[in-house]
Interface confidence: low
């Protein structure tokens, strides 16, 4: 419910789309800030979201998850949600040109209760309101649905983006904020405000920035998990969900000696669970189960029903259907419907893209992509045909380049290149950092088998996505002497990557010497070590043009962007050097109904997935 | 799922006046309108007043001047205010919620005006 606290702050305007705010202080909020709504680049663009007879205006709907998995598409916002108060009213003006349409006023906000998780998918759908005399209300449609994963640290700048959805265009801004007295990138430390802006006095730790300025932190119980403990008072440990214990060091799955039903195990002493109503869960179509003193109950997903969740509350006129999917059904409120899917989609829905890659039709190592209409094999090096079946090579008479040796198998012959080379003839260098995979200026190595990125100061993380700067204090040493912090011309290269690139330099040598030893017996993985796959690895051209670029951390959005730098690196993008077959596939990212509350009166959320490009490992 | 239970529904004279009542209870973010509909004897359901979670509103022609529509957020809840009632306006009130992806209904309460 809303607390009285609260309701002075909602005006009239805002949504209130029954919005119900815990009552416990939220941890932080998650701010989205809309820039631009409107046609795209390029032809096919529409002219205006609204008929040429009627007005409309637009709102947001906004749907937050926690992590970076593939989620279920009936998954519930677990992070929240919010829904934005609507547009100035647009009438499309004949022969004018298409411009970016009038937006709602002020941010979307959706304030998170736990610790924010620094891995976070997200929803943005934009609905259009027609206003025209319909007796139901008002008519809405979906315009454009957008979603994503980032990683994004509490109390970071803001950071901008521009997804694509269609012929649509969106432009927005996000951040994570704690509220006080949460602070950390993840929100879940408490620090009291010092009272005056003096030097920290003895015992206390050193003082960060001024705005985050602390007394002695909160010192929890001894041992309570730093991961999935916290603590409001000093001395205790109160667990985040999912985890139990004194300390908050085990997962409640385990716990089944609290668990009333079942036999008494000899070894544990625990109650063994015994079959129980939730075996299996019998709820469809994502719902969860809970048992019942005589069965079992389903929660369903937002837009389905029954008693397994097996019926769908959805008709056609919400526009279920994705990717170009035809619905058949009744308009009649309470009648089904079904999705006819385009080649290519699957799902209850057409959400989910076929994942025809999966049945691995190119052979000999062909790279497989999947563009929709067709199916594309990229064949390696000798090898040509629909799905790389020809074997081209015959090296006979010919010698292999750089140290590479000739290797006959199946009826043809081959070259098995030498570490970092690669081709028909060992004559291509095969480069893992060619994509360029280290983000904000890192350098690449690339090692026996895959790459390294030694990170410019200030960042860190296997691919430098990380900033460095828990609470805004630099986690960073002082630099070596000669060595500026912050100077993007020199890097560092971390003791563990020098041991790294060294053994793998001495592990490929002695691969090497196996392999040739081997000879004709050689098997893939030595293959594979040796250097005979020849990809050099290169991002596929993203379905949607996600730029992204971190800002300083201003009080809002600012405009000083250039929306048109490419990234190094697709923040969906996931590259993986270190297997044999390479291959190229999308996956549709999928949808997330149901959503939890905003605040300050706003909230939102639905259906429309778009692909990401991801380059991964078979 | 979300719950839809209405109240206030009963006997009344021509002329009179009834508040129903419909509290929602459950996971609610969604709902994009909520409203009543009635169905009487013989005849399809039919939209009577129906108030958006932009606080806009809509009437049957039949019941303008007569009923009014609002909304308590901290209560879950929507009401529907009868005035002038007429011996036509007796049926079966069902609550609606409409979500922006679905619809659901309550059972139903009955308004019978006679006298």
């Known amino acids: 419910m809303v607390s009285p606290r609260m309701s002075g702050l909602l005006s009239q305007t805002v949504i209130l789309a029954l919005i119900f705010l815990p009552q416990t202080r939220p941890a932080g909020v998650f701010e989205l800030q809309i820039h631009s709504f409107g046609p795209g680049p390029g032809p096919g663009a529409p002219r205006s979201p609204c008929s040429a007879r009627l007005p409309c205006r637009l709102f947001f709907r906004v749907c937050l998850k926690p992590g970076l998995s593939e989620e279920a598409a009936e998954s519930p916002c677990a992070l929240g949600a919010a829904l934005s108060a609507r547009g100035p009213v647009y009438t499309e003006q004949p022969g004018a040109p298409a411009p970016d349409l009038p937006l709602p006023d002020g941010l979307l906000q959706v304030p998170f209760r736990d610790a924010w998780p620094g891995t976070f998918s997200f929803i943005i759908e934009t609905w259009r309101e027609e206003l025209g005399d319909q007796i139901g209300g008002p008519a809405w449609s979906l315009l454009a649905r957008v979603a994503g994963r980032r990683r994004l640290a509490a109390g970071g700048p803001w950071a901008r983006d521009i997804q694509r959805a269609g012929a649509w265009e969106l432009r927005f801004s996000y951040r994570a904020r704690c509220e006080p007295p949460a602070v950390g990138t993840a929100c879940t430390r408490l620090c009291r405000p010092r009272s005056a802006p003096s030097r920290c006095g003895p015992g206390l730790r050193p003082c960060a920035p001024l705005e985050d300025e602390c007394e002695a932190p909160l010192v929890c119980r001894a041992g309570c998990s730093p991961e999935h403990g916290f603590c409001e008072q000093p001395g205790e440990c109160r667990c985040l969900e999912g985890w139990t214990g004194p300390l908050c060091t085990v997962p409640v799955s385990t716990s089944s000696c609290l668990s009333p039903r079942g036999p008494s195990s000899a070894t544990t002493g625990c109650l063994v669970p015994g079959p129980g109503p939730c075996d299996g869960n019998p709820c469809a179509n994502g719902g969860s189960c809970s048992e019942t003193p005589r069965s079992f109950e389903c929660t369903c997903p937002r837009g389905f029903y029954g008693l397994r969740c097996e019926v769908s509350g959805v008709t056609c006129a919400d526009g279920p259907c994705f990717n170009g999917g035809l619905c058949v059904g009744g308009a009649d409120p309470d009648s089904a419907y079904i999705c006819h899917c385009p080649p290519g989609f699957q799902g209850s829905n057409c959400e989910k893209r076929v994942d025809r890659c999966s049945l691995q039709p190119c052979r000999n190592g062909g790279l497989c992509l999947d563009l929709g209409h067709a199916l594309r094999c990229r064949c390696r090096a000798g090898f040509a045909g629909p799905r790389c079946e020809h074997d081209l090579d015959d090296c006979a008479g010919r010698a292999c380049a750089n140290g590479g040796t000739c290797v006959e198998g199946g009826g043809a012959h081959r070259c098995s290149c030498a570490l970092g080379f690669g081709g028909r003839d060992c004559r291509e260098r095969a480069d893992p950092c060619a994509a360029r995979p280290c983000a904000h200026g890192g350098r690449c190595y690339a090692h026996f088998s895959g790459l390294v990125c030694a990170c410019a100061p200030g960042y860190m993380g296997a691919r430098c996505e990380f900033p460095v700067h828990p609470d805004g204090a630099s986690a960073l040493p002082a630099a070596p002497p000669g060595l500026r912090p912050g100077d993007p011309q020199r890097y560092l290269l971390p003791p563990a990557l020098g041991l790294l690139v060294a053994a793998g330099v001495a592990g490929a040598a002695l691969l090497l010497v196996h392999v040739r030893r081997r000879g004709h017996s050689q098997d893939a993985g030595s293959r594979l070590l040796a250097g005979t796959p020849e990809p050099s690895v290169h991002a596929l051209p993203d379905a949607l043009n996600n730029l992204r670029t971190q800002e300083g951390s201003g009080d809002g959005p600012s405009s000083s962007v250039d929306w048109n730098r490419p990234e190094d690196v697709d923040p969906q993008g996931i590259y993986v050097i270190s297997a044999p077959s390479i291959y190229a596939r999308e996956v549709a990212t999928p949808l997330f109904p149901p959503l939890h509350t905003g605040r300050a009166g706003q909230r939102q959320h639905l259906l429309f997935p778009y692909p990401s490009s991801i380059l991964s490992v078979k | 799922e979300v719950q839809l239970v209405e109240s206030g529904g009963g006997l009344v004279q021509p002329g009179g006046s009834l508040t129903l009542s419909c509290a929602a209870s459950?996971?609610?973010?969604?709902?994009?309108?909520m409203g009543w509909y009635r169905q009487a004897p013989g005849k399809q359901r039919e939209l009577v007043a129906v108030?958006?979670?932009?606080?806009?509103?809509n009437y049957a022609d039949s019941v303008k001047g007569r009923f009014t529509i609002s909304r308590d957020n901290a209560k879950n809840s929507v009401y529907l205010q009868m005035n002038s009632l007429r011996a036509e306006d007796t049926a079966v009130y069902y609550c609606?919620?409409?979500?922006?992806?679905?619809?659901?209904w309550g059972q139903g309460t009955l308004v019978t005006v006679s006298s």
């Open positions: 108030i958006t979670s932009f606080s806009s509103t």
């Open positions: 609606n919620a409409r979500y922006f992806e679905r619809t659901d």
């Open positions: 459950g996971s609610i973010f969604s709902i994009a309108s």
